[in-house]
């Protein structure tokens, strides 16, 4: 079995303020079992945008039904984009752990740029 890769096919995405951004992410394997998380930025100060396992993220919806059998599509939509949302977004696969899930592999990132609403 080939080791799982996290694919973020879009290096950059441009979205108008007030619109919805779609950030694409797929995994290449069902193994290892574990959730996906999305972050803005990298390193210790990164901001959690979405966690499949737990939490409440009212602006975020998943593109695919995560409970769908054998799902490997972890793309998300972020609604009502503002200039403050600009940055690089990383899709990160975690593997099921005991007791806590462990970060396994990150996608290469997608840079979100926000175009101001024409006045």
């Amino acid at each position: 079995e080939e080791e799982l890769q996290v694919i973020q096919p879009d290096k950059s995405v441009l979205v108008a303020a007030g619109e919805t951004a779609t950030l694409r992410c797929t995994a290449t394997s069902l193994i290892p079992v574990g959730p996906i998380q999305w972050f803005r930025g990298a390193g210790p100060g990164r901001e959690l945008i979405y966690n499949q396992k737990e939490g409440h993220f009212p602006r975020v919806t998943t593109v695919s039904d995560l409970t769908k059998r054998n799902n490997m599509d972890f793309s998300i939509r972020i609604g009502n984009i503002t200039p403050a949302d600009a940055g690089t977004y990383y899709c990160v696969k975690f593997r099921k752990g005991s007791p806590d899930d462990v970060e396994f592999k990150s996608g290469a990132g997608t840079e979100l740029s926000v175009r101001a609403k024409p006045s």
């Epitope: 079995e1 069902l30 193994i31 079992v33 574990g34 966690n51 499949q52 396992k53 737990e54 939490g55 039904d65 995560l66 409970t67 769908k68 059998r69 054998n70 799902n71 099921k96």
Partner: antibody
Framework: QVQLVQSGAEVKKPGASVKVSCKAS????????INWVRQAPGQGLEWIAM????????HYNQIFKDRATLTTDTSTSTAYMELRSLRSDDTAVYYC????????????WGRGTLVTVSS | DIVLTQSPDSLAVSLGERATINCRAS??????????IFWYQQKPGQPPKLLIY???NLDPGVPDRFSGSGSGTDFTLTISSLQAEDVAVYYC????????FGQGTKLEIK
Amino acid sequence: QVQLVQSGAEVKKPGASVKVSCKASGYTFTNYWINWVRQAPGQGLEWIAMIDPSDSETHYNQIFKDRATLTTDTSTSTAYMELRSLRSDDTAVYYCAMDYGSLYAMDYWGRGTLVTVSS
Amino acid sequence: DIVLTQSPDSLAVSLGERATINCRASKSVSSSGYNYIFWYQQKPGQPPKLLIYLASNLDPGVPDRFSGSGSGTDFTLTISSLQAEDVAVYYCQHSRELPTFGQGTKLEIK
């Protein structure tokens, strides 16, 4: 930490119904399937059915299709399994179990609820 | 329905020796390169515990003396060096279609 806490033991008369509950915590309830499995005294494991709490999609073992009903209450992160027209051979420990990988497997289990059917 | 048949029904192995449990499916449980077989351990008075997923992948926290192998219709759970705490009943389960379990194999110490 994923936890599945089941309701207490029940004693029922033949022909009656029983409703077993399974309260989930430590994860987003709507993102993962819940399975129900039973085990008669000294016997093996028997899969009953599964439910997707996000949309109440269910799959049933044909043996239980006419007598079992799975439901969920997303406001309390609780899954329910009701079994009707009880017979003495329904005496068993009933388990709920969560599928963490959408593989139709059982990663995390409740401790079980003993249902005794006796006149 | 896919029927899983485990062999043997019971097994006695000396401490430190290898234990092997087999699970045969009535038809293939493989799809898209994955083998939809899972192994569980159940000790008396406890719920089952997932050991192996997708035939050969060790669940986190499971000692590496446990391993799974096989494809298609024939699968094996192996304990390389039996420990006292491994005494339990072991079940295979498939999810190629709706889940079913094997009948279980009781593992004891010789």
